[in-house]
């Protein structure tokens, strides 16, 4: 059917609670595309009726709630004007009660369920809640060993639990809980987190690191469409802004009228001690005026650029 297959990581999920997965694969989903979800190579799309327990909500697949029998491979098909990509997501559902004495026995827990606090420092834990905006999430409550966390050392800040002056006693099993409301119905979301303590300093210091680009030129033909990713590693939930600029101006502002060159939607992948961010720049049509200009990716205090250049003439063509 002409679709390019992309295989994503496995997701291991807890039964009896809501779950959502967003079909985004930049740069594919940054333009005008249609997204359709399927289960186990079925030809019938997942329902878009919001009353259905499993339904598609814009680019998301939403389970209200997830059930044990929902395990399987789900595909989202992203169709653009000239492209088709099929993304495979393997969902494994397990029965887990977070108040069990041990969090052991879970296969390959993702990094969202394993977090680290740094001894003697002020640090934080993150409650990962990924749902479409049709879901309203109530205030987050935090628990340790099944008791609600209280005390001066702890502050709930958005999806974070701030912990001041981390001690060895702060290791253990945590859970964050929120009530999700969708179409008038309420569901409990409960994420378990196993927390370990380390004396090592955190990941890579506090300056964001631009992995790509690396201050280099790119050969590109006149008139073609070009998409370039800026990949940045930074501390978890940092406050640095990532953007593309030209002539010290945001590209979206610089090309405000023509919209010929645009910044894409930022996405990120969460690792244990850092996030990898991606924000792309799209040249809908490369023009002569683009050559030789440094297009700068900014991430906090870090910068890196690309310069477009015309390919050297290919004399074999003559």
């Amino acid at each position: 059917d002409g679709c390019k297959d992309i295989f994503m990581k496995n997701e291991i999920l807890s039964a009896s609670q809501p779950f959502a997965f967003n079909c985004t694969f930049p740069p594919i989903t940054s333009g005008e595309v249609s997204v359709t979800w399927y289960k186990n190579s079925s030809k019938i799309p997942v329902s878009k009726i919001i009353q259905s327990r499993i339904h598609q909500d814009e680019t998301w697949i939403l389970f209200l709630p997830m059930e044990w029998g929902d395990s399987g491979v789900y595909q989202c098909v992203i169709k653009g004007r000239d492209s088709c990509h099929r993304i495979h997501v393997n969902l494994t559902v397990f029965e887990k009660h977070w108040c069990d004495t041990s969090i052991g026995g879970l296969p390959n827990l993702s990094d969202e369920y394993k977090q680290i606090l740094h001894l003697g420092k002020d640090d934080s834990l993150t409650c990962h809640l990924h749902f479409p905006k049709s879901c309203v999430l109530g205030p987050i409550k935090w628990y340790k060993d099944c008791n609600e966390i209280k005390g001066e050392r702890f502050t709930v800040l958005e999806t974070r639990l701030l912990v001041s002056n981390v001690s060895a006693e702060d290791r253990g099993n945590y859970a964050c809980q929120a009530i999700l409301t969708h179409s008038g119905k309420q569901y409990e979301v409960l994420n378990g987190i196993t927390v370990s303590i380390t004396e090592r300093a955190g990941y890579g210091g506090s300056v964001p690191k631009i992995i790509y680009p690396k201050n280099h030129s790119i050969e590109v033909q006149l008139g073609t469409t070009l998409i370039v990713d800026c990949n940045v590693t930074d501390t978890k939930d940092n406050t640095n802004l990532r953007c593309w600029r030209v002539n010290n101006t945001l590209v979206d502002d610089y090309y405000d009228e023509s919209k010929r060159i645009r910044e894409g939607v930022e996405t990120h992948v969460s690792f244990r001690e850092h996030n990898l961010y991606t924000v792309n720049i799209t040249f809908l049509e490369v023009k002569m005026e683009d050559y030789g200009l440094p297009f700068m990716c900014h991430a906090g205090v870090s910068t890196a650029y690309i310069i477009l250049q015309l390919p050297a003439p290919d004399f074999r063509a003559y």
């Epitope: 502050t155 958005e158 300056v207 939930d237 406050t239």
Partner: antibody
Framework: DLQFQESGPGLVKPSQTLSLTCTVS?????????WNWIRQPPGKGLEWIGY???????NYNPSLKSRVTITRDTSKNQFSLKLSSVTAADTAVYFC??????????WGQGTLVTVSS | DIQMTQSPSSLSASVGDRVTITCRAS??????LNWYQQKPGKAPKLLIY???MLHSGVPSRFSPSGSGNDYTFTISSLQPEDIATYYC?????????FGGGTKVEIK
């Protein structure tokens, strides 16, 4: 919860520099997040002035950039605002606040600064 | 700068009424929309962040929605303690900007 305490003179003469300090309790300003100044003229809306981040980098509102400096004293867990060449239009309640990944989550109680000769 | 246009600028309603406030951004803000409540002489308090997430201690009668450029905030059953000015704020693009505020009064 986090606690903030703004301090500084309540009266500043026109053309002088307004100086305020925010003391933060229960979390280190070098641990994470952005530490902000926001102001509100009497009977009016809110205006973001700028921030200093956990790593020490700053960002200011372009409308005030030429007059604003935000610094920090990590040993005292404080960050400070300086606004130069003030006029009566700078009369406002000045708040300090932490910005999480999305919002100004916690605020100080604010301090009124009047610019008058 | 992104302009945040809030409406209405003021409203008067009875206890138990449903109250809706809207906020429109002049540009796309990718759901980075927050709502605050401010009572006279006090600092603003965060109610809702990232369009649809309620902050600690916020009662469920406060209900948000929206996406793209248009966002709404509803109090399902107005209580006397809800008398305040409400502000929206975008956190997507620097400089971060606030709406002009909506003053909510009891009839």
């Amino acid at each position: 919860d986090l606690q903030f305490q703004e301090s500084g003179p309540g009266l500043v003469k026109p053309s002088q520099t307004l100086s305020l300090t925010c003391t933060v309790s229960r979390y280190s300003i070098t641990a994470d997040f952005a530490w902000n100044w926001i102001r509100q003229p009497p009977g009016k809306g809110l205006e973001w002035i700028g921030y200093i981040s956990y790593s020490g980098d700053t960002n200011y509102n372009p409308s005030l950039k030429s007059r604003v400096t935000i610094t920090r004293d990590t040993s005292k867990n404080q960050f400070s605002l300086k606004l130069s060449s003030v006029t009566a239009a700078d009369t406002a309640v000045y708040f300090c606040a932490i910005r999480g990944p999305y919002s100004f989550t916690y605020w100080g109680q604010g301090t009124l600064v009047t610019v008058s000769s | 700068d992104i302009q945040m246009t809030q409406s209405p600028s003021s409203l008067s309603a009875s206890v138990g009424d449903r109250v809706t406030i809207t906020c429109r951004a002049s540009q796309w803000i990718n759901n980075y929309l927050n709502w605050y409540q401010q009572k006279p002489g006090k600092a603003p308090k965060l109610l809702i962040y990232y369009t649809s997430m309620l902050h600690s201690g916020v009662p469920s009668r406060f209900s948000p929605s929206g996406s793209g450029n248009d966002y709404t905030f509803t109090i399902s059953s107005l209580q006397p303690e809800d008398i305040a000015t409400y502000y929206c704020q975008q956190g997507h693009t620097l400089p971060w900007t606030f709406g002009g505020g909506t003053k909510v009064e009891i009839k």
